[in-house]
């Protein structure tokens, strides 16, 4: 499930690449649409750059 977050954006690193896995616990892209508006990826989980890394290995 993806939820929208406050507007703060930052990291872009690796994790979503495991595309045959499902990440039920991911809380992190900062937008609930496919494009960002004005904020940053502000992951409530505190996971670094979670707005860019959407799947856990």
């Amino acid at each position: 499930p993806i939820s929208a977050f406050a507007v703060d954006i930052p990291e872009t690193h690796g994790g979503e690449g495991y595309e045959d896995e499902i990440d039920d616990e991911y809380e992190g892209d900062w937008s609930n649409s496919s494009s960002s508006t004005s904020g940053a990826g502000d992951p409530s989980s505190g996971k670094e750059k979670s707005w860019l890394y959407t799947l856990d290995p």
Epitope: I9, P10, T12, E16, G17, E19, D29, A40, D42, T54
Partner: antibody, heavy 120, light 112 residues
């Protein structure tokens, strides 16, 4: 060796469209977020777009939002930038960049760039 | 948008000297997750930019230890302890804490 090779730059008229491509090699492409960064003729660097590792999420600054679309094809290890409604201020060298990972730097590898010129 | 202001615009140095470049952000760039995504890049003549420092003070792989980054909040500094010929070029700071991500205008390190 990690390599990024851009292609597709050209001279295009204002209002026109162009698609840039970036071929990646030397790393597990699907594990990393990717971005496009451009450098204007005045040598200013501007972030253009970013895409999450799996391609589900994309991010843009307001000045290109709605005109540019970043996408990726993991099978082809390629990154793309579809540009439409081009303006003279989009004239720049466009660099494909690799993200360093969740705890590292944003642009840890850069391609050599491809030149886009928007002029009538 | 977060405005990144670098000073000086040009920095003439003698080889072996220490060099210091300042970068100031128009607002705090501490991300809500606690990290400060402040980075430094070097673009040598005729080349693409290269990452030097990430998260304020972490040297990227292969970057010599004569490069060091420091600062917090809105004020950041890149120091080169002993300038070598290969260090010449344009240095850019970058913030990745708030969208849109933004770069400073650049500081040209050149021989005095």
């Amino acid at each position: 060796e990690v390599q990024l090779v851009e292609s597709g730059g050209d001279l295009v008229k204002p209002g026109g469209s162009l698609k840039l491509s970036c071929a990646a090699s030397g790393f597990t492409f699907s594990n990393y977020a990717m971005s496009w960064v451009r450098q204007t003729p005045e040598k200013r660097l501007e972030w253009v777009a970013s895409i999450s590792d799996g391609g589900s999420y994309t991010y843009y600054p307001d000045n290109v939002k709605g005109r540019f679309t970043i996408s990726r094809d993991s099978a082809k290890k390629s990154l793309y930038l579809q540009m439409s409604h081009l303006k003279s201020e989009d004239t720049a060298m466009y660099y494909c960049t690799k993200d360093g990972g969740p705890r590292e730097g944003y642009f840890d590898v850069w391609g050599t760039g491809t030149t886009v010129t928007v002029s009538s | 948008d977060v405005l990144m202001t670098q000073t000086p615009l040009s920095l003439p140095v003698s080889l072996g000297d220490q060099a210091s470049i300042s970068c100031r952000s128009s607002q705090s760039i501490v991300h809500s997750n606690g990290n400060t995504y402040l980075e430094w890049y070097l673009q040598k003549p005729g080349q693409s930019p290269k990452l030097l420092i990430y998260k304020v003070s972490n040297r990227f792989s292969g970057v010599p230890d004569r490069f060091s980054g420091s600062g917090s909040g809105t004020d950041f500094t890149l120091k080169i302890s002993r300038v070598e010929a290969e260090d010449l070029g344009v240095y850019y700071c970058f913030q990745g804490s708030h969208v849109p991500y933004t770069f400073g205008g650049g500081t040209k390190l050149e021989i005095k």
